[in-house]
Amino acid sequence: MGCDRNCGLIAGAVIGAVLAVFGGILMPVGDMLIEKTIKREVVLEEGTTAFKNWVKTGTTVYRQFWIFDVQNPDDVAKNSSKIKVKQRGPYTYRVRYLAKENITQDPEDHTVSFVQPNGAIFEPSLSVGTEDDNFTVLNLAVAAAPHIYQNSFVQVVLNSLIKKSKSSMFQTRSLKELLWGYKDPFLSLVPYPISTTVGVFYPYNDTVDGVYKVFNGKDNISKVAIIESYKGKRNLSYWPSYCDMINGTDAASFPPFVEKSRTLRFFSSDICRSIYAVFGSEIDLKGIPVYRFVLPANAFASPLQNPDNHCFCTEKVISNNCTSYGVLDIGKCKEGKPVYISLPHFLHASPDVSEPIEGLHPNEDEHRTYLDVEPITGFTLQFAKRLQVNILVKPARKIEALKNLKRPYIVPILWLNETGTIGDEKAEMFKTQVTGKIKLLGMVEMALLGIGVVMFVAFMISYCACKSKNGK
């Protein structure tokens, strides 16, 4: 009878030990299985979860625009006063709804190439007005012409055309015209076959971004989605030195197993450069734990504050010998037009940049850019890309519309907020397929280990107690 009890207790302890060992073994083995599954599913090839979402994003992406309506155009043109602006918006468009095209796998170098078609659909229900709303904004062609043609002879010619077309420093344009293009009356007088259509994003609809060539991750998962080349080149030819490099991914996803200490590098064709994001905080997105990576102020700093940025300072006059910060001259990438990119409302920009403009209210929460990345898969499940488009206008003695200016202005035209968040259905699916399974496996591991240890300890104590009792 005593033997039966002792045997039962030992058997219980053994079972407990086996469960605990099994639970313990399951930890690295389970992690290995998860890793293997993740590695298999994030590869960019036909049949994987990643590929399906990569070809056509499952997220609805919106681009909201706020236009800076100039309140005192005549005063600025005549007296070189501060420019008073009032932002109007949001005007919302649905973007990135088109699937990637010309997808071609290259099994030799484990890459996949594609183009991303551009398209924008106006969303009246998410906008404060219609595409026909009018704004007073800088005359893009008049401002750009003397910058492109710094030749005083040609400026005299252009002045004749500007006067003939009754153009001036500022113009009134509808939202649709300003964003997507309008026939400029001044450029229309140039007697050569030039493009006479002007718009902040012209041409956009029916155009493509790319060709992008990215690593598919088949041979090395740590390179998945990293851009190998853009438009057939590994460099941009816009910037000197390492600033010209195409680094990282396109920000839609990153190689899996993202750590908080990692700097996420990505390339954005909108700003004609590679940039980076650093860990900001852990947040819960629809029940999915994600890491929020933010663009640090350091990325927009002057070379004085961040020497790594020296090669992004390509001109010395407007940048006050590279001491100004928070604006990026992307003219080289925009056919020589004086386009400057910044954060909305000149967030993180030097005071000299925003000083000539009245009505700006930079706000970290509203105007910063962030990426919410699920750390196991490296997928970006939510993002907010915020940037501002500005045009430099300088005094031009030979152009009457600009001859009264006493200083250069970096004039804000508009700012945009491009956002995408994983849908509720997709989030549920993601939880079921990824985080849910990992949680479940973790719970099973802990349960086995816990139950096993408890059983082993309990049965061993019982066995010892029983033995000492019998010994007496």
Partner: antibody, heavy 117, light 107 residues
Framework: EVQLVESGGGLVQPGGSLRLSCAAS????????IHWVRQAPGKGLEWVAW????????YYADSVKGRFTISADTSKNTAYLQMNSLRAEDTAVYYC??????????WGQGTLVTVSS | DIQMTQSPSSLSASVGDRVTITCRAS??????VAWYQQKPGKAPKLLIS???SLYSGVPSRFSGSGSGTDFTLTISSLQPEDFATYYC?????????FGQGTKVEIK
């Protein structure tokens, strides 16, 4: 086909006047603007005057300022160079030429102006 | 005014020769330089604009180079019809100014 034809040249006494014409075809002179360039016998080219596009401003070489006047009649698609107080050093072949960005892509055949007593 | 100084003022060369004519501006004119060819009794003909841009219909043996203040017209292989006088011209600032010309003669 773009063509420029000058006329009005000839022999004139010092202090005299002459009006040169430049008839254009194949393009609209108001869109481009017209220049007059001269070449003294055996010498190089010298820019003389310019009327900017769309009846814009007029510009002159210092050597002719106050004596020469450039004008255009858009209805006739013709440019003119009114030359007053002519001097011996104004003797030259006068060309009208088309230009927009400052280089001359089309030239007339030239008309000779001789200032001599 | 911007002075354009051409050199040499004349040169003798044979058919097939490579000929180089230089032009120096008295101040920076960026790439706003044109080159012309003129034959006796004829109007000048545009060869090159913007220092390097070959005008339509001009044979590819003509080429231009330079930026700032120093410019060059090169004829890679001189042909019989190339014997003429060549002028450079800056189209950066008014008044527009020409070089004094380079006469290319048969050796």
């Amino acid at each position: 086909e773009v063509q420029l034809v000058e006329s009005g040249g000839g022999l004139v006494q010092p202090g005299g006047s002459l009006r040169l014409s430049c008839a254009a075809s194949g393009f609209t002179i108001s869109s481009f603007g017209i220049h007059w360039v001269r070449q003294a016998p055996g010498k190089g080219l010298e820019w003389v005057a310019w009327i900017a596009p769309y009846g814009g401003d007029t510009y002159y070489a210092d050597s002719v300022k106050g004596r020469f006047t450039i004008s255009a009649d858009t209805s006739k698609n013709t440019a003119y160079l009114q030359m007053n107080s002519l001097r011996a050093e104004d003797t030259a072949v006068y060309y009208c030429a088309r230009s927009f960005f400052g280089y001359f892509d089309y030239w007339g055949q030239g008309t000779l102006v001789t200032v001599s007593s | 005014d911007i002075q354009m100084t051409q050199s040499p003022s004349s040169l003798s060369a044979s058919v097939g020769d490579r000929v180089t004519i230089t032009c120096r501006a008295s101040q920076d004119v960026s790439n706003w330089v044109a080159w012309y060819q003129q034959k006796p009794g004829k109007a000048p003909k545009l060869l090159i604009s913007y220092a390097t841009s070959l005008y339509s219909g001009v044979p590819s043996r003509f080429s231009g180079s330079g930026s700032g203040t120093d410019f060059t017209l090169t004829i890679s292989s001189l042909q019989p019809e190339d014997f003429a006088t060549y002028y450079c011209q800056q189209h950066s600032n008014a008044p527009l100014t020409f070089g004094q010309g380079t006469k290319v003669e048969i050796k």
